[in-house]
């Protein structure tokens, strides 16, 4: 297994923008 | 082997607050974000958000931001939930779980807030 | 946010037949070619316990009698052949996106 796993999923992926604090998380916009 | 403990049950008035501790063994804290869940008194599941235990910074689910804090004392290898201004649907079972590059491996026992005046 | 649908709510099965339980997601979970899908059980007064990572994977220690499949919206869990210890109730989560989301659980009953 890795040997370092901060953020699950989406968060582990947005390696560039792992800063939380920037309240973007990884959300998905959607027009409904 | 690794484990998550988590802190006993709470029991509070409405207005106060309560602040839940979870503590990692077996791995190296810092190497593995921690998420915090709720799970409410009709058994659903539901994301509270997370803390990265290197950097400290703490990200929250929409429906949990502004009452609800995250921290970690790293030298005694323990993330916290505090959660303010507590109120009747803050009631629920809260888990502390450590980041898997996909989901959430390991899950503490959990910790049971009731509030109740 | 999106909304993981699980059916049945519940279902009965016999030792030793296969139980299977359905969870569809409102848009698609998958990223680069990973199904950000995972499956949990939980037993009464126990924290969930994870079972199956990307749709598939089965979690160390987990029996190879659990596997999962699908992808996009549509997934599932199959236990087979059911044993006793397996009663219990079984949720699915998508960690595609923020806010990550659960299925409401499918409760297993052995016959």
């Known amino acids: 297994s890795p040997k370092m796993v901060q953020g699950s999923g989406c968060f582990g992926r947005k390696m560039d923008r792992i800063s939380s604090s920037s309240g973007l998380g990884c959300k998905v916009l959607r027009r409904h | 082997q690794i484990q998550l403990v988590q802190s006993g049950p709470e029991l509070r008035k409405p207005g106060e607050t309560v602040k839940i501790s979870c503590k990692g063994s077996?791995?190296?804290?810092?190497?593995?974000?921690i998420n915090w869940v709720k799970q409410t008194p009709r058994k659903d599941l539901k994301w509270m958000g997370w803390?990265?235990?290197?950097?400290?910074?703490?990200y929250y689910a929409d429906d949990f931001k502004g009452r609800f804090a995250f921290s970690l004392e790293t030298s005694a290898n323990t993330a916290y939930l505090q959660i303010n201004n507590l109120n009747n649907g803050d009631m629920g079972t809260y888990f502390c779980?450590?980041?898997?590059?996909?989901?959430?491996?390991?899950w503490g026992q959990g910790t049971s807030v009731t509030v109740s005046s | 946010d999106n909304v993981l649908t699980q059916s049945p709510p519940s279902l009965a099965v016999s030792l030793g037949q296969r139980a299977t339980i359905s969870c569809k997601a409102n848009w698609p979970v998958d990223y680069n070619g990973d199904s950000y899908l995972n499956w949990y059980q939980q037993k009464p007064g126990q924290p969930p316990k994870f079972l199956i990572y990307a749709a598939s994977n089965l979690e160390s220690g987990i029996p190879a009698r659990f596997s999962g499949s699908g992808s996009g919206t549509d997934f599932n869990l199959n236990i087979h052949p059911v044993e006793e210890e397996d009663a219990a109730t079984y949720y699915c989560q998508q960690s595609n996106e923020d806010p990550f989301t659960f299925g409401s659980g499918t409760k297993l009953e052995i016959k």
């Open positions: 077996g791995y190296t804290f810092t190497h593995y974000g």
């Open positions: 803390i990265n235990t290197h950097t400290g910074e703490a």
């Open positions: 779980t450590r980041s898997h590059r996909f989901g959430l491996d390991y």
